[in-house]
Amino acid sequence: RTTTCFGDGCQNTASRCKNGGTWDGLKCQCPNLYYGELCEEVVSSIDIGPPETISAQMELTVTVTSVKFTEELKNHSSQEFQEFKQTFTEQMNIVYSGIPEYVGVNITKLRLGSVVVEHDVLLRTKYTPEYKTVLDNATEVVKEKITKVTTQQIMINDICSDMMCFNTTGTQVQNITVTQYDPEEDCRKMAKEYGDYFVVEYRDQKPYCISPCEPGFSVSKNCNLGKCQMSLSGPQCLCVTTETHWYSGETCNQGTQKSLVYGHHHHHH
């Protein structure tokens, strides 16, 4: 956030940039949390825009019995590995075809034992506040589907009649990692020393990191004709004085008519 300065007062302004603001020759360049000519004001809203999507990764092991292990399969750049990868990917795409969150598979290692396939199942979903539940459900469906296929697609008399056959007992889920996104935590961190006063509110399923000085939210502080200003002790209303009234009180809701204080002959001091 920047504010430009013109004229002779600029040199003075340069030395007075506050809150870590830096002078660029024309204006104070303010850090994210501040704005104003001298970076003296605290913003009332911080962009913590969530990622568009959230990912999850499941580490799985399956044993393919319809392919005999050969040394070439250890080498990820070999033609054999590439062919295995293609067939395995096609097979898994069929297995997980009903899961909207499914993105694909990534083979990490092939080892002996028929062919033991260590791989990641990649999942992704659009960000919503319920993303954890969505991905948790998807991981459960992945487990169900891989368990089902490795139970059904098995060798009979040493022959497989499917694209791939599996060892029923060789299926394991090692680990599940979900990309963590915690808007409340992000909001607190980015608000730094004002973290106690910033909260996350949702609008159209999007999180907003706001202080009570940001209008239009349920936590918004109504300063009436005054101005909401954030300080280390929290949001405060700075009340205004008009030609006719003084305003005071916690929310600047108490107006005192000047004419009542000074009498009719003292319009202003």
């Epitope: 392919v67 033609q79 062919e83 293609q86 067939t87 040493d158 009649s161 791939m164």
Partner: nanobody, 123 residues
Framework: DVQLVESGGGLVQPGGSLRLSCAAS????????MAWFRQAPGKEREGVAF???????SYAESVKGRFTISRDNALSSLYLQMNSLRAEDTAMYYC?????????????????WGQGTQVTVSS
């Protein structure tokens, strides 16, 4: 690039014999799996015979004892000797290959295919 070219198909009377050949170029014939598949009009493609790099063979029940698969690694060729042919053997015969040592009769596991050669068994 792998290229598979079949030959040897034709019209034969029931009880007769045919020998199909498949010339493989760009394919390391001493490795992986080679196979013969067939597809009759209006039917799914089915596995007929399979041979692995170590000479292990397997056959569809319907052709066991009548068909013999073999491969000549020096000539990069695959063969299918078909004896005692029946009307139900009429189909387009395809040569297929995989670099992997496969034990599956499912066509989807084989990435390399020839154009096919027609076998018609009729009197």
């Amino acid at each position: 690039d792998v290229q598979l070219v079949e030959s040897g198909g034709g019209l034969v009377q029931p009880g007769g014999s045919l020998r199909l050949s498949c010339a493989a170029s760009g394919f390391p014939s001493s490795r992986g799996t080679m196979a013969w598949f067939r597809q009759a009009p209006g039917k799914e493609r089915e596995g007929v015979a399979f041979i692995n790099s170590d000479g292990r063979t397997s056959y569809a029940e319907s052709v066991k004892g009548r068909f013999t698969i073999s491969r000549d690694n020096a000539l990069s060729s695959l063969y299918l000797q078909m004896n005692s042919l029946r009307a139900e053997d009429t189909a387009m015969y395809y040569c297929a290959a995989s670099l992997l040592y496969l034990m599956t009769v499912n066509a989807a596991a084989y990435p390399y295919w020839g154009q096919g050669t027609q076998v018609t068994v009729s009197s």
